[in-house]
Interface confidence: medium
Amino acid sequence: FRNDKCGDTIKIESPGYLTSPGYPHSYHPSEKCEWLIQAPDPYQRIMINFNPHFDLEDRDCKYDYVEVFDGENENGHFRGKFCGKIAPPPVVSSGPFLFIKFVSDYETHGAGFSIRYEIFKRGPECSQNYTTPSGVIKSPGFPEKYPNSLECTYIVFVPKMSEIILEFESFDLEPDSNPPGGMFCRYDRLEIWDGFPDVGPHIGRYCGQKTPGRIRSSSGILSMVFYTDSAIAKEGFSANYSVLQSSVSEDFK
Protein backbone atom coordinates (compact mmCIF):
# COMPACT_ATOMS: atom_id res chain seq x y z
CA PHE A 1 0.00 0.00 0.00
CA ARG A 2 1.27 3.45 -0.90
CA ASN A 3 0.09 6.76 0.53
CA ASP A 4 1.05 9.93 -1.32
CA LYS A 5 -1.43 12.36 0.19
CA CYS A 6 -0.12 15.50 1.83
CA GLY A 7 -0.78 14.25 5.33
CA ASP A 8 -3.01 11.50 6.65
CA THR A 9 -3.74 9.27 9.61
CA ILE A 10 -2.51 5.80 8.80
CA LYS A 11 -3.62 2.84 10.87
CA ILE A 12 -1.21 0.08 9.92
CA GLU A 13 -2.89 -3.05 8.63
CA SER A 14 0.10 -4.22 6.62
CA PRO A 15 3.47 -2.71 5.66
CA GLY A 16 3.05 0.32 3.42
CA TYR A 17 4.63 3.45 2.10
CA LEU A 18 4.04 7.14 2.51
CA THR A 19 5.76 9.65 0.28
CA SER A 20 6.05 13.36 -0.12
CA PRO A 21 3.52 14.27 -2.82
CA GLY A 22 5.09 14.14 -6.26
CA TYR A 23 7.82 11.72 -5.23
CA PRO A 24 10.13 10.84 -6.93
CA HIS A 25 9.84 13.70 -9.38
CA SER A 26 9.42 16.78 -7.22
CA TYR A 27 7.54 18.23 -4.31
CA HIS A 28 5.79 21.55 -4.42
CA PRO A 29 6.77 24.74 -2.65
CA SER A 30 5.01 25.85 0.52
CA GLU A 31 3.86 22.39 1.56
CA LYS A 32 3.08 21.40 5.13
CA CYS A 33 2.13 17.76 5.41
CA GLU A 34 1.59 15.81 8.61
CA TRP A 35 1.15 12.07 8.96
CA LEU A 36 0.16 10.18 12.06
CA ILE A 37 1.10 6.50 11.86
CA GLN A 38 -0.76 4.34 14.32
CA ALA A 39 -0.24 0.71 15.29
CA PRO A 40 -3.48 -1.25 15.64
CA ASP A 41 -2.73 -2.30 19.21
CA PRO A 42 -1.45 -0.10 22.02
CA TYR A 43 1.38 -2.50 22.90
CA GLN A 44 2.78 -2.54 19.36
CA ARG A 45 5.63 -0.42 18.03
CA ILE A 46 6.27 1.04 14.58
CA MET A 47 9.39 0.88 12.44
CA ILE A 48 10.01 3.28 9.55
CA ASN A 49 12.72 3.08 6.93
CA PHE A 50 13.54 5.86 4.48
CA ASN A 51 14.16 4.99 0.84
CA PRO A 52 17.78 5.87 -0.04
CA HIS A 53 16.44 8.11 -2.81
CA PHE A 54 16.02 10.99 -0.37
CA ASP A 55 16.30 14.56 -1.64
CA LEU A 56 15.24 17.65 0.28
CA GLU A 57 16.81 21.09 -0.04
CA ASP A 58 19.93 21.08 2.11
CA ARG A 59 20.46 24.41 3.91
CA ASP A 60 20.72 23.40 7.55
CA CYS A 61 17.14 22.08 7.30
CA LYS A 62 15.84 25.63 7.70
CA TYR A 63 13.60 25.61 4.66
CA ASP A 64 12.69 22.08 3.55
CA TYR A 65 12.75 19.25 6.06
CA VAL A 66 11.03 16.18 7.44
CA GLU A 67 10.67 15.74 11.19
CA VAL A 68 9.90 12.57 13.11
CA PHE A 69 8.27 12.53 16.54
CA ASP A 70 7.78 9.50 18.77
CA GLY A 71 4.17 10.09 19.75
CA GLU A 72 0.80 11.29 18.53
CA ASN A 73 1.87 14.82 17.60
CA GLU A 74 4.71 17.36 17.76
CA ASN A 75 4.68 17.10 21.53
CA GLY A 76 6.06 13.58 21.25
CA HIS A 77 9.74 12.77 21.73
CA PHE A 78 11.69 14.46 18.91
CA ARG A 79 13.57 11.84 16.89
CA GLY A 80 15.13 14.01 14.22
CA LYS A 81 14.92 16.72 11.60
CA PHE A 82 16.22 15.62 8.20
CA CYS A 83 17.10 17.19 4.85
CA GLY A 84 19.72 16.94 2.12
CA LYS A 85 20.44 13.85 0.06
CA ILE A 86 21.38 11.32 2.75
CA ALA A 87 18.48 9.17 3.86
CA PRO A 88 17.86 9.25 7.61
CA PRO A 89 18.43 6.10 9.66
CA PRO A 90 15.52 3.81 10.51
CA VAL A 91 13.33 4.88 13.43
CA VAL A 92 11.49 2.56 15.80
CA SER A 93 8.80 4.07 18.01
CA SER A 94 8.61 3.48 21.73
CA GLY A 95 4.83 3.17 21.56
CA PRO A 96 2.00 2.80 19.05
CA PHE A 97 2.36 6.20 17.34
CA LEU A 98 4.82 8.00 15.06
CA PHE A 99 4.19 11.53 13.86
CA ILE A 100 5.88 12.77 10.68
CA LYS A 101 5.91 16.36 9.51
CA PHE A 102 7.12 17.57 6.10
CA VAL A 103 7.68 21.25 5.37
CA SER A 104 8.87 22.94 2.18
CA ASP A 105 9.45 26.62 1.55
CA TYR A 106 8.51 28.74 -1.44
CA GLU A 107 11.43 27.99 -3.75
CA THR A 108 14.14 25.32 -4.22
CA HIS A 109 12.88 21.76 -4.10
CA GLY A 110 14.00 18.18 -4.63
CA ALA A 111 12.61 14.73 -5.29
CA GLY A 112 11.34 14.32 -1.73
CA PHE A 113 11.19 11.13 0.32
CA SER A 114 9.53 7.76 0.64
CA ILE A 115 9.02 6.00 3.96
CA ARG A 116 8.19 2.35 4.48
CA TYR A 117 6.23 1.78 7.68
CA GLU A 118 5.45 -1.48 9.39
CA ILE A 119 4.75 -2.97 12.79
CA PHE A 120 7.99 -3.60 14.62
CA LYS A 121 7.74 -7.22 15.68
CA ARG A 122 8.70 -7.90 19.30
CA GLY A 123 9.31 -11.57 18.57
CA PRO A 124 12.79 -12.97 19.21
CA GLU A 125 15.20 -11.53 16.63
CA CYS A 126 12.27 -10.69 14.38
CA SER A 127 12.43 -7.56 12.20
CA GLN A 128 15.91 -6.23 12.64
CA ASN A 129 18.07 -3.66 10.93
CA TYR A 130 21.78 -4.30 10.43
CA THR A 131 24.25 -1.47 9.93
CA THR A 132 27.59 -3.07 10.78
CA PRO A 133 30.03 -4.14 8.01
CA SER A 134 29.38 -7.81 8.73
CA GLY A 135 27.01 -9.89 10.74
CA VAL A 136 24.86 -12.96 11.14
CA ILE A 137 21.15 -13.09 10.35
CA LYS A 138 19.20 -15.94 11.89
CA SER A 139 15.57 -16.95 11.85
CA PRO A 140 13.88 -16.70 15.26
CA GLY A 141 15.01 -19.47 17.60
CA PHE A 142 17.58 -20.92 15.18
CA PRO A 143 18.69 -23.74 15.31
CA GLU A 144 15.49 -24.72 17.11
CA LYS A 145 12.27 -24.74 15.13
CA TYR A 146 10.98 -21.30 14.23
CA PRO A 147 7.58 -20.10 15.50
CA ASN A 148 4.42 -20.13 13.40
CA SER A 149 2.71 -17.09 11.87
CA LEU A 150 5.78 -14.89 11.53
CA GLU A 151 6.50 -11.99 9.26
CA CYS A 152 10.04 -10.90 10.03
CA THR A 153 11.84 -8.19 8.08
CA TYR A 154 15.63 -8.04 8.05
CA ILE A 155 17.25 -5.04 6.37
CA VAL A 156 20.99 -4.56 5.92
CA PHE A 157 22.04 -0.94 5.40
CA VAL A 158 25.57 -0.18 4.20
CA PRO A 159 27.22 2.85 2.58
CA LYS A 160 26.23 3.60 -1.00
CA MET A 161 28.43 2.03 -3.65
CA SER A 162 29.16 -0.90 -1.33
CA GLU A 163 28.32 -4.45 -2.27
CA ILE A 164 26.64 -6.74 0.26
CA ILE A 165 27.49 -10.45 0.09
CA LEU A 166 25.07 -12.83 1.78
CA GLU A 167 25.93 -16.50 2.27
CA PHE A 168 23.73 -19.09 3.96
CA GLU A 169 25.31 -21.56 6.34
CA SER A 170 22.07 -23.39 7.00
CA PHE A 171 18.67 -23.33 5.34
CA ASP A 172 15.64 -25.49 6.11
CA LEU A 173 12.11 -24.18 5.66
CA GLU A 174 8.85 -26.03 5.11
CA PRO A 175 8.89 -27.06 1.44
CA ASP A 176 6.18 -26.58 -1.16
CA SER A 177 6.38 -29.78 -3.13
CA ASN A 178 3.54 -29.24 -5.59
CA PRO A 179 4.76 -26.57 -8.02
CA PRO A 180 7.84 -27.24 -10.15
CA GLY A 181 11.01 -26.51 -8.20
CA GLY A 182 8.98 -25.32 -5.21
CA MET A 183 8.92 -21.87 -6.78
CA PHE A 184 5.65 -20.79 -5.18
CA CYS A 185 6.67 -21.45 -1.57
CA ARG A 186 3.11 -21.06 -0.40
CA TYR A 187 3.68 -22.09 3.21
CA ASP A 188 6.93 -20.80 4.69
CA ARG A 189 9.29 -18.69 2.62
CA LEU A 190 12.17 -16.26 2.60
CA GLU A 191 11.92 -13.37 0.13
CA ILE A 192 15.06 -11.40 -0.73
CA TRP A 193 15.32 -7.99 -2.41
CA ASP A 194 18.19 -5.82 -3.61
CA GLY A 195 16.76 -2.76 -1.89
CA PHE A 196 13.66 -2.32 0.25
CA PRO A 197 11.01 -5.06 0.39
CA ASP A 198 8.61 -4.87 -2.57
CA VAL A 199 10.58 -1.94 -4.00
CA GLY A 200 14.07 -3.02 -4.99
CA PRO A 201 14.62 -5.73 -7.59
CA HIS A 202 13.39 -9.08 -6.30
CA ILE A 203 16.30 -11.48 -5.95
CA GLY A 204 14.33 -14.57 -5.10
CA ARG A 205 11.84 -16.60 -3.08
CA TYR A 206 13.20 -19.57 -1.18
CA CYS A 207 11.84 -22.50 0.81
CA GLY A 208 12.53 -26.17 1.45
CA GLN A 209 16.16 -27.22 1.79
CA LYS A 210 17.44 -25.63 -1.39
CA THR A 211 19.95 -23.16 0.04
CA PRO A 212 19.98 -19.82 -1.76
CA GLY A 213 23.27 -19.30 -3.54
CA ARG A 214 25.70 -16.52 -2.80
CA ILE A 215 23.58 -13.38 -2.90
CA ARG A 216 24.96 -10.02 -3.96
CA SER A 217 23.33 -6.64 -3.52
CA SER A 218 24.76 -3.47 -5.00
CA SER A 219 22.17 -0.92 -3.90
CA GLY A 220 23.48 -0.44 -0.36
CA ILE A 221 20.36 -2.12 1.02
CA LEU A 222 19.56 -5.82 1.20
CA SER A 223 16.17 -6.88 2.52
CA MET A 224 14.80 -10.23 3.55
CA VAL A 225 11.28 -11.01 4.72
CA PHE A 226 10.66 -14.34 6.43
CA TYR A 227 7.07 -15.58 6.37
CA THR A 228 5.78 -18.66 8.18
CA ASP A 229 2.29 -20.11 8.20
CA SER A 230 0.29 -21.60 11.05
CA ALA A 231 1.60 -25.16 10.82
CA ILE A 232 4.76 -27.26 10.32
CA ALA A 233 7.96 -25.57 11.43
CA LYS A 234 11.55 -26.39 10.52
CA GLU A 235 14.85 -25.17 11.93
CA GLY A 236 15.04 -22.09 9.72
CA PHE A 237 18.14 -20.38 8.43
CA SER A 238 21.43 -18.78 9.39
CA ALA A 239 23.26 -16.47 7.01
CA ASN A 240 26.42 -14.39 7.16
CA TYR A 241 26.65 -11.05 5.40
CA SER A 242 29.71 -8.95 4.67
CA VAL A 243 30.41 -5.75 2.82
CA LEU A 244 32.84 -5.44 -0.05
CA GLN A 245 34.49 -2.06 -0.13
CA SER A 246 38.09 -1.11 0.46
CA SER A 247 37.28 1.92 2.60
CA VAL A 248 34.48 0.24 4.45
CA SER A 249 35.82 0.92 7.93
CA GLU A 250 35.89 4.65 7.21
CA ASP A 251 32.34 4.69 5.90
CA PHE A 252 30.97 2.93 8.95
CA LYS A 253 32.61 5.27 11.47
Epitope: R2, D4, K5, C6, T19, P21, G22, Y23, P24, H25, S26, H28, P52, H53, H109, A111
Partner: antibody
Framework: EVQLVESGGGLVQPGGSLRLSCAAS????????ISWVRQAPGKGLEWVSS????????YYADSVKGRFTISADTSKNTAYLQMNSLRAEDTAVYYC????????????WGQGTLVTVSS | DIQMTQSPSSLSASVGDRVTITCRAS??????LAWYQQKPGKAPKLLIY???SRASGVPSRFSGSGSGTDFTLTISSLQPEDFATYYC?????????FGQGTKVEIK
Protein backbone atom coordinates in the same frame (compact mmCIF):
# COMPACT_ATOMS: atom_id res chain seq x y z
CA GLU B 1 19.85 25.87 -26.07
CA VAL B 2 18.26 23.12 -24.02
CA GLN B 3 17.52 20.21 -26.29
CA LEU B 4 16.75 16.48 -26.32
CA VAL B 5 17.28 14.29 -29.37
CA GLU B 6 16.04 10.70 -29.56
CA SER B 7 17.40 8.02 -31.85
CA GLY B 8 17.34 4.25 -32.24
CA GLY B 9 13.77 3.67 -33.37
CA GLY B 10 12.88 1.39 -36.22
CA LEU B 11 11.09 -1.77 -37.30
CA VAL B 12 11.53 -4.83 -35.11
CA GLN B 13 9.83 -8.22 -34.95
CA PRO B 14 7.75 -9.30 -31.96
CA GLY B 15 10.03 -10.65 -29.26
CA GLY B 16 12.91 -8.55 -30.53
CA SER B 17 14.94 -5.84 -28.83
CA LEU B 18 15.77 -2.23 -29.50
CA ARG B 19 17.71 0.43 -27.63
CA LEU B 20 16.61 4.03 -27.78
CA SER B 21 18.96 6.90 -26.99
CA CYS B 22 18.16 10.39 -25.76
CA ALA B 23 21.02 12.86 -26.09
CA ALA B 24 20.78 16.06 -24.06
CA SER B 25 22.42 19.38 -24.61
CA UNK B 26 22.21 22.61 -22.66
CA UNK B 27 21.76 20.98 -19.26
CA UNK B 28 23.24 18.20 -17.17
CA UNK B 29 21.57 14.82 -16.71
CA UNK B 30 23.09 14.54 -13.28
CA UNK B 31 20.75 17.16 -11.90
CA UNK B 32 17.38 16.52 -13.54
CA UNK B 33 15.20 13.44 -14.02
CA ILE B 34 14.49 12.12 -17.50
CA SER B 35 11.32 10.31 -18.53
CA TRP B 36 10.25 8.30 -21.54
CA VAL B 37 6.69 8.79 -22.75
CA ARG B 38 5.14 6.98 -25.69
CA GLN B 39 2.24 7.55 -28.01
CA ALA B 40 0.69 4.76 -30.04
CA PRO B 41 -0.60 5.77 -33.49
CA GLY B 42 -3.74 7.85 -33.10
CA LYS B 43 -3.73 7.41 -29.32
CA GLY B 44 -2.89 9.44 -26.24
CA LEU B 45 0.25 9.83 -24.17
CA GLU B 46 1.51 7.05 -21.88
CA TRP B 47 4.30 7.43 -19.35
CA VAL B 48 6.80 4.60 -19.67
CA SER B 49 9.73 5.17 -17.32
CA SER B 50 11.76 7.74 -15.40
CA UNK B 51 15.30 7.89 -14.11
CA UNK B 52 16.43 10.32 -11.45
CA UNK B 53 19.60 12.33 -12.01
CA UNK B 54 22.81 11.44 -10.25
CA UNK B 55 21.53 8.52 -8.18
CA UNK B 56 19.96 6.76 -11.12
CA UNK B 57 16.83 5.52 -9.36
CA UNK B 58 14.41 4.05 -11.87
CA TYR B 59 10.62 3.85 -12.14
CA TYR B 60 8.50 1.95 -14.67
CA ALA B 61 4.92 1.61 -15.84
CA ASP B 62 3.50 -1.83 -15.11
CA SER B 63 3.05 -2.44 -18.84
CA VAL B 64 6.82 -2.45 -19.43
CA LYS B 65 8.19 -3.59 -16.06
CA GLY B 66 10.61 -6.47 -16.50
CA ARG B 67 10.97 -5.87 -20.23
CA PHE B 68 12.29 -2.31 -20.48
CA THR B 69 15.32 -0.87 -18.71
CA ILE B 70 16.05 2.84 -18.40
CA SER B 71 19.60 4.00 -17.81
CA ALA B 72 21.75 7.09 -18.17
CA ASP B 73 25.38 7.76 -18.95
CA THR B 74 26.04 11.11 -17.30
CA SER B 75 29.46 11.40 -18.94
CA LYS B 76 27.75 11.32 -22.34
CA ASN B 77 24.68 13.24 -21.15
CA THR B 78 22.58 10.51 -22.72
CA ALA B 79 19.68 8.43 -21.45
CA TYR B 80 18.76 5.04 -22.85
CA LEU B 81 15.69 2.84 -22.99
CA GLN B 82 16.55 -0.80 -23.59
CA MET B 83 13.41 -2.53 -24.84
CA ASN B 84 13.32 -6.32 -24.82
CA SER B 85 10.59 -8.85 -25.58
CA LEU B 86 8.82 -6.28 -27.72
CA ARG B 87 5.13 -6.71 -28.49
CA ALA B 88 2.85 -5.27 -31.16
CA GLU B 89 1.28 -3.03 -28.50
CA ASP B 90 4.67 -1.37 -27.91
CA THR B 91 4.40 0.22 -31.35
CA ALA B 92 4.50 3.96 -30.73
CA VAL B 93 6.43 7.17 -31.05
CA TYR B 94 8.77 7.30 -28.05
CA TYR B 95 9.62 10.69 -26.59
CA CYS B 96 12.16 11.50 -23.95
CA UNK B 97 11.39 14.45 -21.75
CA UNK B 98 13.14 16.36 -19.00
CA UNK B 99 11.45 16.73 -15.67
CA UNK B 100 12.10 20.37 -14.81
CA UNK B 101 13.74 21.29 -11.52
CA UNK B 102 12.05 24.64 -11.13
CA UNK B 103 9.07 23.76 -13.30
CA UNK B 104 6.88 20.90 -12.12
CA UNK B 105 6.30 19.03 -15.32
CA UNK B 106 8.00 17.75 -18.46
CA UNK B 107 9.30 21.03 -19.73
CA UNK B 108 11.62 19.89 -22.52
CA TRP B 109 10.76 17.14 -25.02
CA GLY B 110 12.61 15.46 -27.83
CA GLN B 111 11.17 15.18 -31.31
CA GLY B 112 10.29 11.50 -30.83
CA THR B 113 11.43 8.29 -32.50
CA LEU B 114 9.07 5.73 -34.01
CA VAL B 115 9.23 2.11 -32.89
CA THR B 116 7.24 -0.35 -34.99
CA VAL B 117 6.83 -3.92 -33.76
CA SER B 118 5.53 -6.09 -36.55
CA SER B 119 6.26 -9.35 -38.26
CA ASP C 1 -3.08 3.95 -10.09
CA ILE C 2 -4.67 7.37 -10.44
CA GLN C 3 -7.00 7.64 -13.44
CA MET C 4 -7.38 10.95 -15.24
CA THR C 5 -10.57 11.64 -17.20
CA GLN C 6 -10.83 14.58 -19.57
CA SER C 7 -13.95 16.08 -21.04
CA PRO C 8 -14.96 16.70 -23.66
CA SER C 9 -12.93 14.34 -25.84
CA SER C 10 -13.27 16.82 -28.68
CA LEU C 11 -14.82 20.20 -29.30
CA SER C 12 -15.32 22.60 -32.19
CA ALA C 13 -14.76 26.30 -31.64
CA SER C 14 -14.09 29.49 -33.52
CA VAL C 15 -11.23 31.96 -33.27
CA GLY C 16 -11.94 34.32 -30.38
CA ASP C 17 -14.05 31.80 -28.45
CA ARG C 18 -13.51 31.05 -24.79
CA VAL C 19 -12.71 27.35 -24.43
CA THR C 20 -12.81 25.29 -21.24
CA ILE C 21 -11.46 21.75 -20.85
CA THR C 22 -11.94 19.79 -17.64
CA CYS C 23 -9.90 17.02 -16.10
CA ARG C 24 -10.97 14.83 -13.19
CA ALA C 25 -8.67 12.64 -11.09
CA SER C 26 -9.87 9.39 -9.54
CA UNK C 27 -8.48 10.53 -6.19
CA UNK C 28 -7.14 13.77 -4.78
CA UNK C 29 -3.91 14.91 -6.39
CA UNK C 30 -3.68 18.25 -4.57
CA UNK C 31 -2.31 20.60 -7.27
CA UNK C 32 0.06 18.06 -8.83
CA LEU C 33 -1.35 18.54 -12.31
CA ALA C 34 0.12 19.68 -15.61
CA TRP C 35 -1.47 20.53 -18.98
CA TYR C 36 0.22 19.88 -22.33
CA GLN C 37 -0.57 20.98 -25.87
CA GLN C 38 0.26 18.71 -28.80
CA LYS C 39 0.00 19.46 -32.50
CA PRO C 40 -0.03 16.70 -35.15
CA GLY C 41 3.39 15.18 -35.72
CA LYS C 42 4.97 17.24 -32.94
CA ALA C 43 6.06 16.59 -29.39
CA PRO C 44 3.84 17.78 -26.53
CA LYS C 45 4.50 21.20 -25.04
CA LEU C 46 4.12 22.03 -21.36
CA LEU C 47 1.52 24.77 -20.82
CA ILE C 48 0.57 24.68 -17.14
CA TYR C 49 2.14 23.05 -14.10
CA UNK C 50 1.09 22.98 -10.47
CA UNK C 51 -2.51 23.21 -11.76
CA UNK C 52 -2.30 26.96 -12.32
CA SER C 53 1.27 28.13 -13.07
CA ARG C 54 2.04 29.01 -16.67
CA ALA C 55 5.24 27.56 -18.13
CA SER C 56 7.80 29.91 -19.60
CA GLY C 57 6.72 31.51 -22.89
CA VAL C 58 3.10 30.39 -22.65
CA PRO C 59 0.65 33.15 -23.60
CA SER C 60 -1.52 34.62 -20.85
CA ARG C 61 -4.71 33.49 -22.59
CA PHE C 62 -3.98 30.01 -21.19
CA SER C 63 -4.91 29.56 -17.56
CA GLY C 64 -5.37 26.61 -15.25
CA SER C 65 -7.37 26.19 -12.07
CA GLY C 66 -8.52 23.56 -9.66
CA SER C 67 -7.27 21.46 -6.79
CA GLY C 68 -7.98 18.03 -5.40
CA THR C 69 -9.83 16.09 -8.07
CA ASP C 70 -11.31 18.69 -10.46
CA PHE C 71 -9.24 20.85 -12.79
CA THR C 72 -9.86 23.21 -15.67
CA LEU C 73 -7.79 24.53 -18.56
CA THR C 74 -9.20 27.72 -20.04
CA ILE C 75 -8.23 29.44 -23.27
CA SER C 76 -9.74 32.91 -22.91
CA SER C 77 -9.69 33.82 -26.62
CA LEU C 78 -8.89 31.00 -29.00
CA GLN C 79 -6.22 31.78 -31.60
CA PRO C 80 -5.56 29.92 -34.88
CA GLU C 81 -2.39 28.36 -33.45
CA ASP C 82 -4.32 26.92 -30.50
CA PHE C 83 -6.08 24.23 -32.54
CA ALA C 84 -4.43 21.11 -31.12
CA THR C 85 -4.95 18.26 -28.67
CA TYR C 86 -4.64 19.03 -24.96
CA TYR C 87 -3.67 16.53 -22.26
CA CYS C 88 -3.76 16.74 -18.48
CA UNK C 89 -1.21 14.80 -16.45
CA UNK C 90 -1.01 13.96 -12.75
CA UNK C 91 2.34 13.66 -11.06
CA UNK C 92 1.13 13.15 -7.53
CA UNK C 93 2.47 9.62 -7.65
CA UNK C 94 4.04 6.99 -9.84
CA UNK C 95 2.80 5.79 -12.24
CA UNK C 96 2.40 9.19 -13.82
CA UNK C 97 -0.85 9.18 -15.78
CA PHE C 98 -2.33 11.31 -18.55
CA GLY C 99 -5.88 12.10 -19.50
CA GLN C 100 -7.07 10.67 -22.82
CA GLY C 101 -6.84 14.06 -24.53
CA THR C 102 -9.19 16.74 -25.80
CA LYS C 103 -9.02 17.67 -29.47
CA VAL C 104 -9.85 21.33 -30.20
CA GLU C 105 -10.96 21.70 -33.82
CA ILE C 106 -11.99 24.61 -35.99
CA LYS C 107 -15.74 25.07 -36.27
Amino acid sequence: EVQLVESGGGLVQPGGSLRLSCAASGFSFSSEPISWVRQAPGKGLEWVSSITGKNGYTYYADSVKGRFTISADTSKNTAYLQMNSLRAEDTAVYYCARWGKKVYGMDVWGQGTLVTVSS
Amino acid sequence: DIQMTQSPSSLSASVGDRVTITCRASQSISSYLAWYQQKPGKAPKLLIYGASSRASGVPSRFSGSGSGTDFTLTISSLQPEDFATYYCQQYMSVPITFGQGTKVEIK
